[in-house]
């Protein structure tokens, strides 16, 4: 399992805000309600990326192919770019993914999974309050 400790979190955060977040919301758009229970959490940034990686790329019985979605492709590119050695760990996973059938419909289970992803990303980009305040005072 990849260790996300040495990733450039600020660069990943910027990529998320710029593109990935919009693709996640596009995926969720049109749903009547997004009030799924949050069952997945994370306690620090590396842990958040571990959970995001798992939910985005590991197929589950009722939601097999999120990895083909635009947000997943961008997530993969972002992690490959800003996490040293990440792309090497994904070669086997990518080869296995190519054998799977393409998703035909967005199932409620997939919507729930993407809702969980939005929650994990929100935790990941949560700025440390004290450090932000120090930065704010320093520059003003």
């Amino acid at each position: 399992m990849y260790d996300f400790t040495n990733c450039d979190f600020q660069k990943i955060e910027a990529d998320y805000l710029r593109t990935i977040s919009k693709d996640l919301i596009t995926y969720m758009s049109g749903t009547k309600s997004t009030d799924f229970n949050n069952t997945v959490s994370c306690s620090n940034r590396p842990h958040c990326l571990t959970e995001i990686q798992s939910l985005t790329f590991n197929p589950t019985p009722r939601c097999a192919s999120l990895a083909k979605e635009m947000f997943a492709r961008k997530t993969k590119a972002t992690l490959a770019l800003w996490c040293p050695g990440y792309s090497e760990t994904q070669i086997n996973a990518t080869q296995a993914m190519k054998k799977r059938r393409k998703r035909k419909v967005t199932t409620n289970k997939c919507l729930e999974q993407v809702s969980q992803l939005l929650g994990l990303w929100r935790r990941f980009i949560r700025t440390l309050l004290k450090k932000q305040l120090e930065h704010h005072h320093h520059h003003h």
């Epitope: 009030d35 949050n38 306690s43 620090n44 939005l118 929100r122 949560r126 309050l129 932000q132 305040l133």
Partner: antibody, heavy 121, light 111 residues
């Protein structure tokens, strides 16, 4: 300048649906990280968090009340709506809406003045 | 939902003395080294007023006699020296996980 204002029916009868509106200005609910929360203070009791809705349309509810609550937004009109179904006298309270934020602005706190709702037969 | 248990439910403190209010969370409200715990003061007929954010940070304009401490699941609000205007109900609030939740409140009376 950030302002929030709650509006509601004032008085309603048991079993009716309570509809509340939070009208706000000074920020946009389309901005990343922004959200609105609904909170109530029943007479003689403590603050109770009811529900929240975020810029990305994610919604969260107090587990004990979830089956009765509906929250929605009209970001273009700067309004958030809360509905509570099948009200009882226990729902008599002052209802507040508040701006909630992730990240940088989390240390700010903006609340409306509250609107009193009385459930009475 | 994260449950916050506040104690005591009510507290009577002499003018100039120390008031200590405790808040225990059912699970950790820490993330990446910061505690997502707030403290509010509420007086009758008014909305709650934020005193402390991130467990120990004093909001601008709040007197220095208010202080917060703690991490993980155990948090404390201290008021010292207590003044007459501090008579109010105090609430802890966690903003670590949706839905946010409040403690049951502590009513502070000044003797």
């Amino acid at each position: 300048q950030v302002t929030l204002k709650e509006s509601g029916p004032g008085i309603l009868q048991p079993s009716q649906t309570l509809s509340l509106t939070c009208s706000f200005s000074g920020f946009s609910l389309s901005t990343y990280g922004m959200g609105i929360g609904w909170i109530r203070l029943p007479s003689g009791k403590g603050l109770e968090w009811l529900a929240s809705i975020w810029w990305d349309d994610n919604r969260y509810f107090n587990a004990a009340l979830k089956s009765r609550l509906t929250i929605s937004k009209d970001a273009s009109k700067n309004q958030v709506f809360l509905k509570i179904a099948s009200v009882d006298t226990a729902d008599t309270a002052t209802y507040y809406c508040a701006r909630i934020e992730d990240g940088y602005y989390s240390y700010h706190s903006y609340w409306g003045q509250g609107t009193l709702v009385t459930v009475s037969a | 939902d994260i449950v916050l248990t506040q104690s005591p439910a009510s507290l009577a403190v002499s003018l100039g003395q120390r008031a200590t209010i405790s808040c225990k969370a059912s699970q950790s409200v820490d993330f990446d080294g910061d505690s997502y715990m707030n403290w509010f003061q509420q007086k009758p007929g008014q909305p709650p007023k934020l005193l402390i954010y991130a467990a120990s940070n004093l909001v601008s304009g709040i007197p220095a006699r208010f202080s917060g401490s703690g991490s993980g699941t155990d948090f404390t609000l201290n008021i010292h020296p207590v003044e007459e205007e501090d008579a109010a109900t105090y609430y802890c609030q966690q903003i670590d996980e949706d839905p946010y939740t409040f403690g049951g409140g502590t009513k502070l009376e000044i003797e």
